[in-house]
């Protein structure tokens, strides 16, 4: 005999949780449902769109001898290396008979230390010749404030108070190193150190 009385109510007994973490994090979202009769295929949605190439696995177990008895179904969606493109609202969707059921939503968010999109590059310059260096970083969380350092000495009193994405250097008379620090609410990330070699005059 069926283990649950059935009504036109969502068959979901478990909904996706929330995942918030830094880039590269691995996590699993799950949906759980108990249905009478043939178990449905579980589809995953992100921001309302079906994920065609989702890394999901579905486990289904009959709870009785008769195929019209209840089945338990667990679908697991694996996020192997969290990226900005993975963020959004996740739901499970099933078609049962002539009805569509959608789970309650879970959310995937990215939050961690700043991530560099651009870092200062090594270069060779003529003495006392102006040049620019670039540095760009993003969160979340935003805002991300930059602090430039020359030979490990900060060029501003605090992050965000000096030059940001582009540092204009009016000229150098000796080889120097430059780096930039990206600060957000989660902490600080330091870029690579660029060596600016000054050619003798």
């Amino acid at each position: 005999a069926p283990r649950g009385t059935q009504a036109e109510e969502s068959p979901f007994v478990g909904n996706p949780g929330n995942i918030t973490g830094a880039r590269g994090l691995t996590g699993t979202l799950r949906c759980q449902l108990q249905v009478q009769g043939e178990p449905p295929e579980v589809h995953w949605l992100r921001d309302g769109q079906i994920l065609e190439l989702a890394d999901s696995t579905q486990t289904q177990v009959p709870l009785g001898e008769d195929e019209q008895d209840d089945w338990i179904v667990v679908s697991q969606l694996r996020i192997t290396s969290l990226q900005l493109s993975d963020t959004g609202q996740y739901q499970c969707l099933v078609f049962l008979g002539h009805q569509t059921f959608v789970s309650q939503p879970g959310y995937v968010g990215l939050e961690g230390l700043p991530y560099f999109l651009e870092e200062p590059e090594d270069r060779t310059v003529a003495a006392n010749t102006p040049f620019n260096l670039s540095c760009q970083a993003q969160g979340p969380p935003e805002p991300v404030d930059l602090l430039w350092l020359q030979d490990a000495v900060p060029l501003a009193t605090a992050p965000g108070h000096g030059p940001q994405r582009s540092l204009h250097v009016p000229g150098l008379n000796k080889t120097s190193s430059f780096s930039c620090e990206a600060h957000n609410a989660k902490g600080v990330t330091t870029s690579r150190t660029a060596t600016i070699t000054v050619l003798p005059q």
């Epitope: 009385t5 009504a7 007994v13 799950r30 486990t59 338990i72």
Partner: antibody, heavy 120, light 107 residues
């Protein structure tokens, strides 16, 4: 703050009936599956019954099926367990528990319990 | 019916120790395992669900792990307030079933 308060327990004779209530506050009651779990004197926990948020799906332990009915009144934020044909082996502390959002078959908040003693 | 077996009725530990409480399911429950803590005179409190997801407000010294049929709850840096009964439960399917409990006590 999630709060669950059971009432309705007592001492009854075998074959009698009893109705437990659980008043919920601090959350949107209709969004959560709810369960009754009992604990016997030997400290063992035994699941009794569960009900979906809207009340349309119910699940029972085999040896209470046909004797116990789980129900809910969402407008009153109240969960019920109607128990009939009570047996001495039903003697236990009955807890009302909220199902976790990620799986309402896992219970994330429990009441303090209501004692049921079935004895001749 | 899925049987949850907690092989140790009692486990002795010392403050600051690391202890693992184990639970075995009679069939694969696809990580649908919860862990509860119960102190004398109190109702059970959820610690872990889906084998490794910590419930809100649970200290990170409590860690759940496992898959298939074998699961464990590890408490690192045991505190005196951790001395209690611990129960595993499968939340894979009805009938929902609990282990018999493990009492964590001081050596």
């Amino acid at each position: 703050e999630v709060n669950l308060v059971e009432s309705g327990g007592g001492v009854v004779k075998p074959g009698a009936s009893l109705k437990l209530s659980c008043e919920a506050s601090g959350f949107t009651f209709s969004n959560y599956g709810m369960s009754w779990v009992r604990q016997t004197s030997d400290k063992r926990l035994e699941w009794v019954a569960s009900i979906s948020g809207g009340g349309g799906r119910t699940y029972y332990l085999d040896n209470v099926k046909g004797r116990f009915i789980i129900s809910r009144e969402n407008a009153k934020n109240t969960l019920y367990l109607q128990m009939s044909s009570l047996k001495s082996e039903d003697t236990a502390l009955f807890y009302c528990a909220r199902g976790a959002r990620a799986s309402y078959f896992a219970m994330d908040y429990w009441g303090q319990g209501s004692s049921v003693t079935v004895s001749s | 019916v899925i049987v949850m077996t907690q092989s140790h009725k009692f486990m002795s530990t010392s403050v600051g120790d690391r202890v693992s409480i184990t639970c075995k399911a009679s069939q694969d429950v696809t990580t649908a395992v919860a862990w509860y803590q119960q102190k004398p005179g109190q109702s059970p409190k959820l610690l872990i669900y889906w084998a490794s997801t910590r419930h809100t407000g649970v200290p990170d010294r409590f860690t759940g792990s496992g898959s298939g049929t074998d699961y464990s709850l590890t408490i690192s840096n045991v505190q005196t307030e951790d001395l209690a009964f611990y129960y595993c439960q499968q939340h894979f399917t009805t009938p929902l079933t609990f282990g018999a409990g493990t009492k964590l006590e001081l050596k």
